[in-house]
């Protein structure tokens, strides 16, 4: 049975759909080798954080810190990067939050495919000086797990040199690659001595090797990728929205909710209200009021305006959320001072992430 | 693993009730909507409605409001859908389904005859 | 309501060909379609969600695309084991509606 009772008939159905939200996907933070680089979880009451980085458990070292919600990296490497997530423990329950970390100065998977840095990779060499393969650039090879999400584009590199100028070919899984081994091929951009992917899928998972080669010697260079697979999840709304508020008689307030869904979300402002004089129905459940839903006759249903408030207004304001999933709903208290008290934010509002779950 | 057990198949008499149960396991019951899906015999599928157990919201199709209820046991994680009016062409097998509707029920074959 | 309109309503192909159904909804649902796959006296099957993803499992031949009225479900490569029938639905406002179904037959 419902854990409210509605003052008022809210049927909603059948909705306008809202007129836009957003596919999640993981934030990407992106440092350059050298540099620290911060990181909060952005999970709500949580008894117990764990980290993991690239699926395997993340503990403190002398360049890692985890301080609470924070993950702190002092001096960042490219061998950083990858697929990083907090999980906070409760009780009942788990919820997770990925992002991804790259460090770099350089193109990488997931970054726009037309290269604007390659050229000085393709080496010229004096054609007296014979010479065997060799890596002109090391440093773009040193992250060889590449976890990526599902439908990006991923880039291996293996910049070389050698005289005369080595070919490259690749494998996977020990095997030659070929282009009939996966939907849409691949491109091996040979001037930039790259391997491109588009749109990966899991059964793109494995070891991709290049082989650079000439009369003189080969050399060759793993990278590991691992795909990773979205599923469509219930809403998500960030961490800290709607904040809590106060203003005074007479004033202007607006609470805040951010949403982040695979599929339409359906966004509801619920108060708890007074009927007949008490806050509870006859079957003990509390008297909820609709402010404001999603739909046809509504504007920016993310955020709830009220003007003019009363001291009626001041209790607890319910942002509740559902898609086909499931449902996500968090509150805020409205606290409405007397004229002469200045309002003030009772709550610092947070960057807003995007999610994969 | 995750899994939706239904009960078992009924028959009714035209004018009666039937109430279907959908036992989940192997996944948090109260962070999924449970949805009802019927389909009659060489028909296609049709949504009969849904509900997100950890507070009861129910939601329904217009077209079986009022004779379609939907409740969940969070105690012992089981959905419930329940027909009431019964007329021949409620003959079908209902199937219930998780939130993301990637597990479903095996289905409950409701035959409606007089 | 929204109604989705399938077509074809049944379609005979050879192994190894690349099948196409199409799905059209009578107003824009963004990209929050799903496809699903039926055999005989069995429960329906997620193949693909959220217009073009691909659920976990699901082989690679099967793919989704379009957005707004307009959809697509493709298998690039019909196996024997693909015989079924397949529906597509829209998850974006209630109530949830199925297309009629394509029944899909080895030539």
């Known amino acids: 049975r419902p854990s409210f009772s509605l003052v008022e008939d809210t049927t909603l159905e059948p909705e306008e759909p809202p007129t836009k939200y957003q596919i999640s996907q993981p934030e990407v933070y992106v440092a350059a080798p050298g540099e620290s680089l911060e990181v909060r979880c952005l999970l709500k009451d949580a008894a117990v954080i764990s980290w993991t980085k690239d699926g395997v458990h993340l503990g403190p070292n002398n360049r890692t810190v985890l301080i609470g919600e924070y993950l702190q990296i002092k001096g960042a490497t490219p061998r950083d990067s990858g697929l990083y997530a907090c999980t906070a423990s409760r009780t009942v329950d788990s919820e997770t939050w990925y992002f991804m970390v790259n460090v770099t100065d350089a193109i990488s998977s997931g970054d726009d495919e037309d290269d604007t840095d390659g050229a000085e990779d393709f080496v010229s060499e004096n054609s007296n000086n014979k010479r065997a393969p060799y890596w002109t650039n090391t440093e773009k090879m040193e992250k060889r797990l590449h976890a990526v999400p599902a439908a990006n584009t991923v880039k291996f590199r293996c910049p070389a040199g050698g005289n005369p100028m080595p070919t490259m070919r690749w494998l996977k899984n020990g095997k030659e690659f070929k282009q009939e081994h996966r939907i849409g091929g691949y491109k091996v951009r040979n001037q930039h001595w790259s391997l491109i992917m588009e749109s990966v899928v899991p059964s793109d998972k494995g070891n991709y090797t290049c082989v650079v080669e000439n009369e003189y010697g080969s050399i060759n260079h793993t990278y590991h990728l691992d795909v990773v697979e979205r599923s469509p999840h219930r809403p998500i709304l960030q961490a800290g929205l709607p904040a809590n508020a106060s203003t005074v008689v007479g004033g202007d307030v607006e609470f805040v909710c951010k949403v982040y869904s695979d599929a339409q979300p359906h966004i509801q402002w619920i108060k708890h209200v007074e009927k007949n004089g008490s806050k509870y129905g006859p079957d003990g459940l509390p008297y909820l009021k609709v402010l404001k839903h999603s739909g046809i006759n509504s504007s920016n249903a993310e955020v709830l305006a009220l003007f003019n408030v009363t001291e009626a207004d001041a209790g607890e304001y319910i942002c509740k959320v559902s898609n086909y999933i499931g449902q996500a709903n968090q509150s805020a208290w409205l606290t409405v001072l007397p004229k002469q008290q200045a309002p003030g934010r009772e709550k610092e509002i947070t960057a807003s992430p995007d999610y994969l779950e | 693993q995750v899994q939706l057990v239904q009960s078992g198949a009924e028959v009714k008499k035209p004018g009666s009730s039937v109430k279907v149960s959908c036992k989940a396991s192997?996944?948090?019951?109260?962070?999924?909507?449970v949805h009802w899906v019927r389909q009659a015999p060489g028909q296609g599928l049709e949504w009969i409605g849904s509900?997100?157990?950890?507070?009861?919201?129910?939601t329904y199709n217009q077209n079986y409001r009022g004779r379609a209820t939907i409740t969940a046991d969070k105690s012992t994680s089981t959905a419930y859908m329940e027909l009431s009016s019964l007329r021949s062409e409620d003959t079908a097998v209902y199937y219930c389904?998780?939130?993301?509707?990637?597990?479903w029920g095996q289905g409950t074959l409701v035959t409606v005859s007089s | 309501d929204i109604q989705m309109t399938q077509s074809p309503s049944s379609l005979s192909a050879s192994v190894g060909d690349r099948v196409t159904i199409t799905c059209k909804g009578s107003?824009?649902?963004?990209?929050?379609i799903a496809w699903y796959q039926q055999k005989p006296g069995k429960a329906p099957k997620l193949l693909i969600y959220?217009?073009?993803y691909r659920y976990s499992g699901v082989p690679s031949r099967f793919s989704g695309s379009g957005s707004g009225t307009d959809f697509t479900f493709t298998i690039s490569s019909l196996q024997p084991e693909d015989i079924a029938t397949y529906y597509c639905?829209?998850?974006?406002?209630?109530?949830?509606?199925f297309g009629q179904g394509t029944k899909l037959e080895i030539k």
């Open positions: 107003n824009g649902i963004s990209n929050d």
């Open positions: 509900i997100y157990p950890d507070n009861g919201d129910s």
């Open positions: 389904a998780r939130g993301d509707f990637a597990y």
């Open positions: 959220s217009a073009s």
């Open positions: 192997g996944y948090i019951f109260t962070s999924y909507n």
């Open positions: 639905q829209q998850h974006s406002t209630t109530p949830y509606t």
